[in-house]
């Protein structure tokens, strides 16, 4: 008799999820020699243990602590790049600017980026049919809790000047409900972080507006200032040129504003 299975509103676990996580872990430790000591089988076991046999609407940060412990990694605290709604450009930037790191450049972020996963209460099965949607089903689902946990830890680790890349094409350039707005902003440590510098990325070719004057950026400045952290903001009018100039800073066209 087929067992009744909970139907959730979100897509199911990414196909080949266990194999993908394990392979990404192995590749990461190969690319980053400082993480060679990591036992990827143990990492996968801890990852699996966080959500398997648990109700996918009842996951806690505590469930991920064994994984957090195994994935502990020291990144230079003054080289952290946060982002909101502009992931691809942030990742392109850190591929070129090798001494800066997004969350997805760390082991745990690299393992999970763009994947979905969930289990079922009281069975050891992974649910490949559907997983809870944050809005329609529940917020304490395996994926959301994972990103909340690693994002909080990443922000807590930051020091000196922290950069954040924001999407100037969105109606809310700063969104209080994004992971950046709801988790990372509130977990920057004022005793360690001197300044949050926002880079507002322009989308349009002819867009010369000063998006640092946008009301949502002013709202971000207010939140940050109240936390005793300084705030600064820069417009990146030409993201393509910006990347090119990060790659080749000596290029003569890179002295002008980007």
């Amino acid at each position: 008799v087929p067992r009744w299975r909970q139907q959730w509103s979100g897509p199911g676990t990414t196909k080949r999820f266990p194999e993908t996580v394990l392979a990404r872990c192995v590749k990461y430790t190969e690319i980053h020699p400082e993480m060679r000591h990591v036992d990827c089988q143990s990492v996968w076991d801890a990852f699996k243990g966080a959500f398997i046999s648990k109700h996918p609407c009842n996951i806690t940060e505590e469930d991920y602590q064994p994984l957090m412990k195994l994935g502990t990694q020291t990144v230079p605290c003054n080289k952290i790049l946060l982002w909101s709604r502009i992931k691809d450009l942030a990742h392109q930037f850190t591929q070129v600017q090798r001494d800066m790191f997004t969350l997805e450049d760390t082991l745990l972020g690299y393992l999970a980026d763009d994947l979905t996963w969930c289990g079922e209460f009281n069975t050891s099965k992974i649910n490949y049919q559907s997983c809870p949607d944050w809005r329609k089903d529940c917020s304490n689902n395996p994926v959301s809790v994972f990103w909340k946990t690693v994002s909080r830890r990443f922000a807590e680790a930051a020091c000196d000047v922290v950069h954040v890349m924001l999407n100037g094409s969105r109606s809310k350039i700063f969104d209080k409900n994004s992971t950046f707005g709801s988790v990372e902003v509130h977990n920057l440590q004022p005793e360690k972080v001197q300044t949050l510098e926002a880079w507002v990325i322009h989308g349009g070719r002819e867009d010369s507006r000063d998006l640092c004057q946008d009301p949502t950026i002013k709202e971000l400045e207010s939140i940050i200032s109240k936390r005793n952290i300084q705030f600064s903001c820069k417009n990146i009018y030409r993201p393509d040129k910006f990347l090119q100039c990060v790659k080749n800073p000596e290029d003569s066209s890179c002295t002008s504003e980007i």
Epitope: R16, E19, T20, V21, L22, A23, R24, K27, D88, H91, Q92, Q95, V96, R98, D114, L243, K247
Partner: nanobody, 117 residues
């Protein structure tokens, strides 16, 4: 399924040069990388060099300054220019495509490089 086609191997004298090519059926994008590994008889396969989508490179210490990896994204091709070859560079050279999203390594059939006088 990514297909890889290697070429350019052969026999060369110490101090000589070779250029390996590898054409992929899919372009390098996002966090995918292409690279070259080698396996000498009785030894484990080891990384020689890899290149990411934006031209970022990694090299094994043993080949730094002698080998250069490059790519032509328009042709989905990665090259390995090998100069000042040494007998210890003798191995089968394998083209590798790491597909980040799928968490999969794809491999070419391998091309033999022999450095001998």
């Amino acid at each position: 399924q990514v297909q890889l086609q290697e070429s350019g191997g052969g026999l060369v004298q110490p101090g000589g040069s070779l250029r390996l090519s590898c054409v992929a059926s899919e372009r390098i994008f996002s966090r995918n990388t292409m690279g070259w590994y080698r396996q000498a008889p009785g030894k484990q396969r080891e990384l020689v060099a890899r290149i990411a989508s934006l031209g970022i490179t990694n090299y094994a210490d043993s080949v730094k300054g002698r080998f250069t990896i490059s790519s032509d994204n328009a042709k989905n091709t990665v090259y390995l220019q090998m100069n000042n070859l040494k007998p210890e560079d003798t191995a089968v050279y394998y083209c590798n495509y790491w597909h980040y999203a799928a968490g999969r390594d794809y491999w070419g059939q391998g091309t033999q490089v022999t450095v001998s006088s």
